[in-house]
Amino acid sequence: DITPSVPPASYHPKPWLGAQPATVVTPGVNVTLRCRAPQPAWRFGLFKPGEIAPLLFRDVSSELAEFFLEEVTPAQGGSYRCCYRRPDWGPGVWSQPSDVLELLVTEELPRPSLVALPGPVVGPGANVSLRCAGRLRNMSFVLYREGVAAPLQYRHSAQPWADFTLLGARAPGTYSCYYHTPSAPYVLSQRSEVLVISWEDSGSSDYTRGNLVRLGLAGLVLISLGALVTFDWRSQNRAPAGIRP
């Protein structure tokens, strides 16, 4: 809790906290945190988790307060909450805190992973699904083919991943992906590791079939040798004819 004096939720419901232009921004951007109360308030406070004293105050007789973070640095990223209060509530009494707003200030987002489902080797005519997975929700994911500047496919996703379907005939190739924020200022991830999709071609099938034949023949040779050794061993251990113990 922000203070020991937070009343039950039924008394003073929590406000809403949002960020403009976005919750993920590049360093140097001016960010406005907007705290909106469900009723007119007198004072608003912006809090960092674990701190009892507000980071910033705003004294406004309305339902909305704006907290300006100018030219943000990565150090200003993190969790924020806001509360509001009215003069008739008594000293130190604040509303329920808003839900946590996570502000991320970074030049680039972490590298996504790119994997093929069910695997990177495709049979003729079979489709393959590529999953580009990042760490953040509500991002735009973009799939690229090596040697081509424009995105092959793109997909906005509420999940921290997006799936792309490649048609079997066109699937083989080298792929990579990125994800980025869906609104300005656009923050782009690092590029994923490349993923090579290849044919399960007839050559490799013939090679595998050849190996199976060789293994089979080797097995037969081993069985034959085993039989000969056993036969020889039993011959040597059998008593010669005409000799009695």
């Epitope: 735009s140 424009a150 995105p151 496919q153 997909r155 906005h156 990125y178 869906p182 782009l188």
Partner: antibody
Framework: EVQLVQSGAEVKKPGESLKISCKGS????????IVWVRQMPGKGLEWMGS????????RYSPSFQGQVTISADKSISTAYLQWSSLKASDTAMYYC?????????????????????WGQGTTVTVSS | EIVLTQSPGTLSLSPGERATLSCRAS???????LAWYQQKPGQAPRLLIY???SRATGIPDRFSGSGSGTDFTLTISRLEPEDFAVYYC?????????FGGGTKVEIK
């Protein structure tokens, strides 16, 4: 003035080939996708595909993949839509439009604006 | 692919009235990637709104867009005679790009 000017109306027979054009002017042709949209008589809009004029790399709607070919010649700021063998069901109005290319750190990302300039449309009639 | 369903199919209103057009997506669409177009008979479509709520250049302020997730709305605050047309929503955040089926706003 920014504009996209499309080639004139065409009347063709089934099985014939056709190539229609869309010429951009008044802006940097390679800074925008060129998008092709079909509108069949009395129907809505359908995205056929888009081309990045920078390297003439085209993207197709699954419904139109293999049915049409989209190409571009950036030296004359022109994009093309072509059919190798027309069908009666290709009778429609075809529009080209532009959509801004967004780049971050030299990477082309998801388009972040709508189609802000449209050609006047090319009517294609296929009938025996 | 994301399917966009527009409602109503036809809206019969008088000049000066308020028009509210709905566009519902089969899956979540970021508001950054939703556009509205107007098309009059015999003309090419015209971009009205992009990013769900940003007016395109030269579009009068009687046109406004709102919404997020799967529900988006185009509002024309006071219909002018030139506003009677067909309106399409479109998402361009996931390939393939898709359009709604359109809403015709006609004079009552």
């Amino acid at each position: 003035e920014v504009q996209l000017v499309q080639s004139g109306a065409e009347v063709k027979k089934p099985g014939e080939s056709l190539k229609i054009s869309c010429k951009g002017s008044g802006y940097s042709f390679t800074s925008y996708w060129i998008v092709w949209v079909r509108q069949m008589p009395g129907k809505g809009l359908e995205w056929m595909g888009s081309i990045y004029p920078g390297d003439s790399d085209a993207r197709y709607s699954p419904s139109f993949q293999g049915q049409v070919t989209i190409s571009a010649d950036k030296s004359i700021s022109t994009a093309y839509l072509q059919w190798s063998s027309l069908k009666a069901s290709d009778t429609a109005m075809y529009y080209c439009a532009r959509q801004k290319i967004t780049m971050v750190r030299g990477v082309i990302i998801t388009p972040l604006d709508g189609m802000d300039v449209w050609g006047q449309g090319t009517t294609v009639t296929v009938s025996s | 692919e994301i399917v966009l369903t527009q409602s109503p199919g036809t809206l019969s209103l008088s000049p000066g009235e308020r028009a509210t057009l709905s566009c519902r997506a089969s899956q979540s669409v970021s508001s950054s990637y939703l556009a509205w177009y107007q098309q009059k008979p015999g003309q090419a479509p015209r971009l009205l709104i992009y990013g769900a709520s940003s007016r395109a250049t030269g579009i009068p302020d009687r046109f406004s867009g709102s919404g997020s997730g799967t529900d988006f709305t185009l509002t024309i605050s006071r219909l002018e005679p030139e506003d009677f047309a067909v309106y399409y929503c479109q998402q361009y955040g996931s390939s393939p790009l898709t359009f709604g089926g359109g809403t015709k706003v006609e004079i009552k």
